[in-house]
């Protein structure tokens, strides 16, 4: 038992916010500005993310943990921990390499982001358009014919709309 | 079309300065930033610094205390200044866009060589 | 500074081929990584941001892929124009900092 405690890497005392510093003989010594270390036994402290441009600071860098960047107003964030800013559009409307435009007659966005969705097909699953679609807003599919007798059970609602996918631009 | 077109001497001898006017047509200097990245013969890219839309700047800790970057948004113009030359300072320096989607270089000016020599 | 390394400097391929370029920083830089194109004599070209994001104009025989710190740039279907050295780049933090460069040459 005391062999193997003696064995153990001193590191592993240094808890986060520290680095284990080889050059003052593996004593732990707080992580430098502007640099971090979110898990204990770290040799070195990661420099912070620093959100400069479309990337504001959502979330100030400690010794413990990274800043996070979000986008400036207009834009929304794309990729892992946001590492991109892609420009807001207008619902109704979808982002393409000439910038934003309307949805096309029979597609909608109800979003500020992400690409014009096609109109539910109500008649696929045996239902009528109860409230027709626009830019903005899906169809709403109400009961088939047949069940607009008296007594038919009411309108059923719409089904939530998925989260658009983003292409790679 | 975005373009970027730089301007600036050829030769200039040791302890001098360099200065280069990168003029940009296509785009705004209010709305996008403008970085200097150089590349010395043969090798890699070595970051220099960057003038924001709205003004500020950011330089590389490096070159901090011989480095200056300006610009005018009315004549679409950005101006680097770079003292104390030196002949590792041989390199050709571009001008670069700023993405509007991240921090990175979209489009870039055509260069400019730069030897340092007596 | 974060470092990137790009530990192959030469590569040889042939048209038709698929190469990948790799990329390592020194530390998680998340996908803060930009990639460029410089074809001999010409200024760099931007290629893929955000570790993944293709510019606009560029071919979809490019894609970039990784996070944390290993990051890749693949060509499908190699084209004679492809010759060129590529680069990385760093935006999690200043300085921003690049690859030393990989040369792509065609055979």
């Known amino acids: 038992f005391e062999r193997t405690r003696s064995l153990q890497d001193p590191c592993s005392n240094c808890p986060a916010g520290t680095f284990c510093d080889n050059n003052r003989n593996q004593i732990c010594s707080p992580c430098p500005p502007n640099s971090f270390s979110s898990a204990g036994g770290q040799r070195t402290c990661d420099i912070c993310r620093q959100c400069k441009g479309v990337f504001r600071t959502r979330k100030e860098c400690s010794s413990t943990s990274n800043a996070e960047c979000d986008c400036t107003p207009g834009f929304h964030c794309l990729g892992a921990g946001c590492s991109m800013c892609e420009q807001d559009c207008k619902q109704g409307q979808e982002l393409t390499k000439k910038g934003c435009k309307d949805c096309c007659f029979g597609t909608f966005n109800d979003q500020k982001r992400g690409i014009c969705r096609p109109w539910t097909n109500c008649s696929l699953d045996g239902k009528s358009v109860l409230v027709n679609g626009t830019k903005e807003r899906d169809v709403v599919c109400g009961p088939s014919p047949a069940d607009l007798s008296p007594g038919a059970s009411s309108v059923t609602p719409p089904a939530p709309a998925r989260e658009p996918g983003h292409s790679p631009q | 079309q975005v373009q970027l077109k730089q301007s600036g001497p050829g030769l200039v001898q040791p302890s001098q300065s360099l200065s280069i006017t990168c003029t940009v047509s296509g785009f705004s200097l209010t709305t996008y930033g403008v970085h200097w990245v150089r590349q010395p013969p043969g090798k890699g890219l070595e970051w220099l610094g960057v003038?924001?839309?709205?003004?500020?700047?950011d330089y590389n800790d490096a070159f901090i205390s011989r480095l200056s970057i300006t610009k005018d948004n009315s004549t679409s113009q950005v101006f680097f200044k770079m003292n104390g030359l030196q002949a590792d300072d041989t390199a050709i320096y571009y001008c670069?866009?700023?993405?509007?989607?991240?921090?990175?270089?979209?489009?870039w000016g055509q260069g400019t060589t730069l030897t340092v020599s007596s | 500074d974060i470092v990137m390394t790009q530990s192959q400097k030469f590569m040889s391929t042939s048209v038709g081929d698929r190469v990948s370029v790799t990329c390592k920083a020194s530390?998680?830089?998340?996908?803060?990584v930009a990639w460029y194109q410089q074809r001999p004599g010409q200024s760099p070209k931007a290629l893929i941001c955000s570790a993944s994001y293709r510019y606009s104009g560029v071919p979809d025989r490019f894609t970039g892929s990784g996070s944390g710190t290993d990051f890749t740039l693949t060509i499908s279907n190699v084209q004679s124009e492809d010759l060129a050295e590529y680069f990385c780049?760093?935006?999690?933090?200043?300085?921003?900092?690049f690859g030393s460069g990989t040369k792509l040459e065609i055979k």
């Open positions: 670069a866009r700023n993405s509007i989607t991240s921090v990175s270089f979209d489009c």
């Open positions: 780049q760093q935006y999690n933090s200043y300085p921003l900092t």
């Open positions: 003038i924001w839309s709205d003004g500020n700047t």
């Open positions: 530390q998680n830089v998340g996908t803060t």
